[in-house]
Amino acid sequence: ESALITQQDLAPQQRAAPQQKRSSPSEGLCPPGHHISEDGRDCISCKYGQDYSTHWNDLLFCLRCTRCDSGEVELSPCTTTRNTVCQCEEGTFREEDSPEMCRKCRTGCPRGMVKVGDCTPWSDIECVHKESGTKHSGEVPAVEETVTSSPGTPASPCSLSG
């Protein structure tokens, strides 16, 4: 919990403008939910529901809260110490290799395959070949059996920082 974030840890777009960069203050760091003032003397609260910081830091700005996209539900709101937690709506999922959007889950498995895993907010339905038991990967085939999935699944703390 005593991890800290400094200016150098941030992605370029999150860093302070060059003229505002300064060395670490002798005073130390500011707690989660705060950022440091430009003169390095004071800690300033992040604004509730607008921005946040999760660790002890010497950031000149708090980080902007993520806004959930349409197609996502807000699992927990942004606080001054924690970003918004968004999750794909029922019947959709977010893949690791395309985290920018929620995709519709398939409604069933291709012929010759059986469903072994439901649609969850973080994975499509899982299909395996009846005989071999190997997983199916790839695009949804044109012909599908009427094996339908149940999209109702427990929530996951799948937080995206925007």
Epitope: S2, L4, P31, D42, C43, S45, K47, Y48, T80, T81
Partner: antibody
Framework: QVQLVQSGAEVKKPGASVKVSCKAS????????LHWVRQAPGQGLEWMGW????????KYNEKFKDRVTITADKSTSTVYMELSSLRSEDTAVYYC????????????WGQGTLVTVSS | DIQMTQSPSFLSASVGDRVTITCRAS??????VAWYQQKPGKAPKLLIY???TRHTGVPSRFSGSGSGTDFTLTISSLQPEDIATYYC?????????FGGGTKLEIK
């Protein structure tokens, strides 16, 4: 339950120093910031500074920076506040208080320690 | 430092009255204001934080509102046990500062 138990009342002469202790229990010591707040007789509250045992971070109110030292003993979950070069206007009840590592409000307070500075 | 000016400094009201205490910050503090209740010889107790969020176990008759520079603590129906001094505090920027207090007494 959460408890912050402070040391007893002190009477000091002007120019002397005083060291007040605050023993924390009922929660994980390294997860909360501990503060010192003072209250002169019949007066309002004044924040003096904090100590965070999780990373030894200390911050002082500039007003007291030259005279106050906050330390801790993690083995006993105790925080100390030492105020030097005492003057009569330092006569006050000194409270320790804690806050989570988020917004700076205080959810639990010690019972207070009266420090009297008198010649 | 941010000055927190509380008014009134003294207030006399009857049981069952609606009581309002105000606090004005010398500069914008967003919604970073807390309210405390202090009884004689005791430490302050947290009532409200983030201007309007009631702390655990605080009766619903206590409510807070405001943002920017003007904040209000309201007791919807004054009870005998509410007799105390009330303080506002800004937790927006260090040094965190308190109002001068409002002493509430029963008529």
């Amino acid at each position: 339950q959460v408890q912050l138990v402070q040391s007893g009342a002190e009477v000091k002469k002007p120019g002397a120093s005083v060291k007040v202790s605050c023993k924390a229990s009922g929660y994980t010591f390294t997860e909360y910031i501990l503060h010192w707040v003072r209250q002169a007789p019949g007066q309002g509250l004044e924040w003096m500074g904090w100590f965070y045992p999780g990373n030894n971070n200390i911050k002082y109110n500039e007003k007291f920076k030259d005279r106050v030292t906050i330390t801790a003993d993690k083995s006993t979950s105790t925080v100390y506040m030492e105020l030097s070069s005492l003057r009569s206007e330092d006569t006050a009840v000194y409270y320790c208080a804690r806050h989570e590592q988020g917004p700076g409000y205080f959810d639990y307070w010690g019972q207070g320690t009266l420090v009297t500075v008198s010649s | 430092d941010i000055q927190m000016t509380q008014s009134p400094s003294f207030l006399s009201a009857s049981v069952g009255d609606r009581v309002t205490i105000t606090c004005r910050a010398s500069q914008d503090v967003n919604t970073a204001v807390a309210w405390y209740q202090q009884k004689p010889g005791k430490a302050p107790k947290l009532l409200i934080y983030w201007a309007s969020t009631r702390h655990t176990g605080v009766p619903s008759r206590f409510s807070g509102s405001g943002s920017g520079t003007d904040f209000t603590l309201t007791i919807s129906s004054l009870q005998p046990e509410d007799i105390a001094t009330y303080y506002c505090q800004q937790h927006y920027i260090t040094p965190w500062t308190f109002g001068g207090g409002t002493k509430l007494e029963i008529k």
